[in-house]
């Protein structure tokens, strides 16, 4: 807490300007009127205040707005946002995308902080869903944002917002998240033609079921190995050698380099060695000729 001291004669601030950088903490506290500060917040970011001086300005705003700052002040916080705590931000009602953008701009390049996470949470909850404009903004500042959401939170993303998602936005998503996003992407891109559809859906395929992979294998898509390696193991296992060959096209040769890794390893174990040999890649570990394959999952389903 800064002690309450009288403002020295002639030092009362008439406006927020650069002369204030020469004020000591106690002079800022005594000589700057909180209401003046609130109306001239847009000037603060142009003035090279130290973090210590910003603490004093924050204290003045906190006293003026104990229930939380109005959006007119929030939009112009600038570097003062770096001094806010998640508790401060929980008191705010941010409705304008412009305000959100202004605050994310201050944090550009920073790691995702609890302050930013709280701000985004408040904003998205206020909107009711993660609409396309918001998602566009968030992923522009934080490419990993989408993958930081839980499957439950992702379920509120409307399919129309999927158009804003770039491949790099999904880099850190796990299979549970892709399980939620894939059906939305399929719906969003359903009216596109084959090759265009594949380009758009490719980064979401970690959530695709077997039947969709089978369908893609009939469309000459030439899936690359990096995408194939991210597919769900349980979705890959039922694919035949012929289907995988069609799915990968010229990239099928890459299976050899990945034969020890999932899902390739597990898929090989499910194929007849005869069928694997037709690829001419020297893949080993398939079911030897003459062995009977029992599908235990089907047996369990019947019982």
């Amino acid at each position: 807490e800064v002690e309450k001291t009288a403002c020295p004669s002639g030092k009362k601030a008439r406006e927020i300007d650069e002369s204030l950088i020469f004020y000591k903490k106690w002079e800022l506290e005594a000589c700057v009127d909180a209401a003046l500060l609130a109306t001239q917040m847009d000037r603060v970011n142009a003035i090279p205040f130290t973090y210590e001086q910003l603490d004093v300005l924050k204290h003045k705003l906190d006293e003026l707005y104990p229930q939380g700052y109005p959006e007119s002040v929030i939009q112009h916080l600038g570097y003062l946002f770096l001094k806010m705590s998640p508790e401060d931000i929980r008191k705010w009602n941010v409705t304008s995308l412009e305000t959100l953008k202004a605050l994310l701009e201050v944090n550009k390049g920073h790691e995702m902080s609890p302050q930013v996470a709280t701000l985004i949470d408040r904003f998205v909850k206020g909107r009711g869903q993660l609409d396309k404009d918001t998602l566009d903004t968030l992923t522009a500042f934080y490419p990993g944002y989408l993958c930081s959401l839980s499957p439950e939170e992702l379920s509120s993303v409307p399919p129309s917002s999927i158009w804003a998602v770039r491949p790099q936005d999904l880099d850190t998503c796990d299979p549970r998240q892709l399980d939620v996003l894939y059906p939305k992407a399929r719906l969003a891109f359903q009216n596109m033609n084959g090759s265009e559809y594949f380009v758009k859906i490719q980064s979401f395929l970690g959530g695709a079921p077997t039947e969709d992979l089978k369908a893609l294998s009939q469309q000459n898509v030439s899936m690359d190995l990096a995408t194939f390696m991210k597919l769900r193991t349980d979705a890959v296992l039922p694919l035949t050698v012929a289907e995988v060959q069609k799915l990968l096209g010229p990239h099928v040769e890459g299976l050899k380099a990945e034969e020890r890794h999932r899902p390739v390893r597990d898929w090989i174990l499910r194929q007849r060695q005869d069928d694997l040999d037709t690829l001419g890649l020297g893949l080993q570990g398939g079911i030897p000729n003459g062995y009977l394959v029992l599908d235990l999952s089907m047996q369990e389903a019947l019982s």
């Epitope: 973090y51 770096l82 550009k108």
Partner: antibody, heavy 117, light 107 residues
């Protein structure tokens, strides 16, 4: 008086790791943001990272993002820089500095990191 | 990133001379500029913050001016202990960036 003393530098092979420390005294460490700045031999100064007093706000320059991790222990008045996947271009004198927002008001003497095979 | 360009890269001067060093920012940084002095084998030392605010304990022969993109550090009467490298640094936006220095040498 304010004092910052870096340690932990040395010779390391490319791909190796080092952990730098900065011991602070003469001020209330937990009240201040702290930064790491480096200077390659005969080159410009390069600010590489900072951390807020509470550790909630962190920034890395692109050249070290994903390889370096800044942290602090306010109870021990110490700032750290964990450096992984080191490259020849990371060879520099590393300074810790007290960061007051508009400038760095106090600097340590620096610790030399040499990355070479 | 904001680029900081210092000129000249070196200057030869005599004791008692007036020396002026300039720093130009690639975009408007208002007055978010600091100047530092570095002597061989030593850490940089803060001279001026906020473009013109003299740091406590720094001799008054040092002064800073400028705003926007063009800034100046002036040493009104060079002293023997002033031979060093001088750096400017912007703090208007992240990442903070430094100029590459101006070396003040003995003529």
């Amino acid at each position: 008086q304010v004092q910052l003393v870096e340690s932990g530098g040395g010779l390391v092979k490319p791909g190796g790791s080092l952990r730098l420390s900065c011991a602070a005294s003469g001020f209330t460490f937990s009240d201040y943001y702290m930064s790491w700045i480096r200077q390659a031999p005969g080159k410009c100064l390069e600010w590489i990272s900072y951390i807020s007093s509470s550790e909630s706000i962190i920034y890395y320059v692109d050249s070290v993002k994903g390889r370096f991790t800044i942290s602090r222990d306010n109870a021990k008045n110490s700032l750290y820089l964990q450096m992984n996947s080191l490259r020849a271009e990371d060879t520099a004198v590393y300074y810790c500095a007290r960061d007051v927002g508009s400038h760095f008001d106090y600097w340590g003497q620096g610790t030399l990191v040499t990355v070479s095979s | 990133d904001i680029q900081m360009t210092q000129s000249p890269s070196s200057v030869s001067a005599s004791v008692g001379d007036r020396v002026t060093i300039t720093c130009r920012a690639s975009q408007d940084i208002s007055r978010w500029l600091a100047w530092y002095q570095q002597k061989p084998g030593k850490a940089p030392k803060l001279l001026i913050s906020a473009a013109s605010r003299l740091q406590s304990g720094v001799p008054s022969r040092f002064s800073g001016s400028g705003s926007g993109t063009d800034f100046t550090l002036t040493i009104s009467s060079l002293q023997p202990e002033d031979f060093a490298i001088y750096y400017c640094q912007q703090a208007k936006s992240f990442p903070r960036t430094f100029g590459c220095g101006t070396k003040v040498e003995i003529k």
